[in-house]
């Protein structure tokens, strides 16, 4: 967790109906999907992984929208617009299992989050979201 | 309450601040409907390119 | 043409689980949510909660968590609802019914299963 | 959570009475949805988001209402409408239906 008692990710998770997706065997096709220009580097990548039934498991990866690191610019620097949104969720308390991205309930805030904010914005041009961090409001 | 921050990312020309937070405002009851997110206080802004995850890290609005 | 059919009825003793499927057809399945709802004998509707195959996400009305999982197979395009240590009072009709995200999300629950009665009964 | 309660729980009417079911919430609500079910079938989306009638609905149903209070209208009773109705709101998690009205033919 940062400096600011907020938890973050960092992973930039892709509209499906934006990128043609790569599946595992394992996989089914969803909307956290990656382009397939990206499948060979899994070391870069946040795995979403939800348990759908006995005999199988969904699987995506998503890529860093940006590094950590300030000299690596992304790779979308052209004919991409960022917005920087935020907001209060009132019915929810803050506590500290949102500084741990590894909780339950930080991946459950997180995933909702996620695929709201893909639905929302579906229509059009939407890339993806990033930089997911929660703090005490 | 719990503050949620976070970047979205937008073919370049296809919409404009206002139009991000008019869309997000317009399902805030369908999210508290769907999710059980209660949300409130929407601030958008645009962000100046480059940037990376750790210099917007500390980014509050 | 879009249709929702559900597994059969099934009679189980208390303290056991029972697992009963819900198959769409006739839509893009990983596009909608499957919502279920319990139905009493006699009684009116209640939501249990709701999955959607696109990701697997799931959210339950806190009444029902810990009594029902809800997963989905989307390579035979099927959602399930597992209810577990059934007591007399899980005795329902178990209905499941698609609807839509956002923005399309006021149109409702436009399609419903026929309904699966779970019986406890020792 | 968001309490709806029907009135009247059970009526009856004659062919080509008007009919009128009503449904409040505890909280304001954005909209709501009604639901037919007769018995031994699932229940079927009869009018979604307040005042829309959902495909195949005949259209001497109609739908009111905003807050929290809220109606569905039969203009003219007919032996088919007979069935049991439920409104649903869908603003605050968890969804809640009413309790429902039984309509009857006479």
């Known amino acids: 967790a940062s400096g600011s008692a907020s938890g973050s990710a960092s992973t930039l998770v892709h509209n499906g109906t934006s990128a043609r997706a790569t599946t595992t065997p394992a996989s089914k096709s969803t909307p956290f999907s990656i382009p397939s220009h990206h499948s060979d580097t899994p070391t870069t990548l946040a795995s979403h992984s939800t348990k759908t039934d006995a005999s199988s498991t969904h699987h995506s990866s998503v890529p860093p929208l940006t590094s950590s690191n300030h000299s690596t610019s992304p790779q979308l620097s052209t004919g991409v617009s960022f917005f920087f949104l935020s907001f209060h969720i009132s019915n929810l308390q803050f506590n500290s299992s949102l500084e741990d991205p590894s909780t339950d309930y930080y991946q459950e805030l997180q995933r909702d989050i996620s695929e709201m904010f893909l639905q929302i914005y579906k229509q059009g041009g939407f890339l993806g979201l990033s930089n997911i961090k929660f703090r005490p409001g | 309450s719990v503050v949620v921050q976070l970047t979205l990312a937008f073919r370049e020309g296809t919409i404009n601040v206002h139009d991000v937070e008019t869309q997000f405002n317009q399902y805030k009851t369908e999210a508290a409907s769907r999710y059980n997110l209660t949300i409130s206080d929407v601030s958008v802004s645009d962000v100046p390119f480059p940037f990376s995850a750790q210099s917007h890290h500390h980014h509050h609005h | 043409q879009i249709q929702l059919q559900q597994s059969g009825p099934e009679l189980v003793k208390p303290g056991a689980s029972v697992k009963i499927s819900c198959k769409a057809s006739g839509y893009t399945f990983t596009d909608n949510y499957i919502n279920w709802v319990k139905q009493r004998p006699g009684q009116g509707l209640e939501y249990i909660g709701w999955?959607?195959?696109?990701?697997?996400?799931?959210k339950f009305n806190e009444k029902f968590k810990g009594k029902a999982t809800l997963t989905v197979d989307t390579s035979s395009r099927t959602a399930f609802m597992q209810l577990s240590s059934l007591t007399f009072e899980d005795s329902a009709v178990y209905f499941c019914?698609?609807?839509?995200?956002?923005?399309?999300?006021?149109?409702?629950?436009?399609?419903w299963g026929q309904g699966t009665s779970v019986t406890v009964s020792s | 959570q968001i309490l709806l309660t029907q009135s009247p729980a059970i009526m009856s009417a004659s062919p080509g009475e008007r009919v009128t079911i009503t449904c409040s919430a505890s909280s304001s609500v954005s909209y709501i949805h009604w639901f037919q079910q007769k018995p031994g079938t699932s229940p079927k989306l009869w009018i979604y988001?307040?005042?829309n009638l959902a495909s195949g609905v005949p259209p001497r149903f109609s739908g009111s209402g905003s807050g929290t209070s809220f109606s569905l209208t039969v203009s003219r009773m007919e032996a088919e409408d007979a069935a049991t109705y439920y409104c649903q709101q869908r603003s605050s998690y968890p969804p809640t239906f009413g309790g429902g009205t039984k309509l009857e033919i006479k």
């Open positions: 988001s307040t005042s």
């Open positions: 999955i959607y195959p696109g990701s697997g996400n799931n």
């Open positions: 019914a698609r609807d839509y995200p956002f923005p399309s999300y006021h149109y409702g629950m436009d399609y």
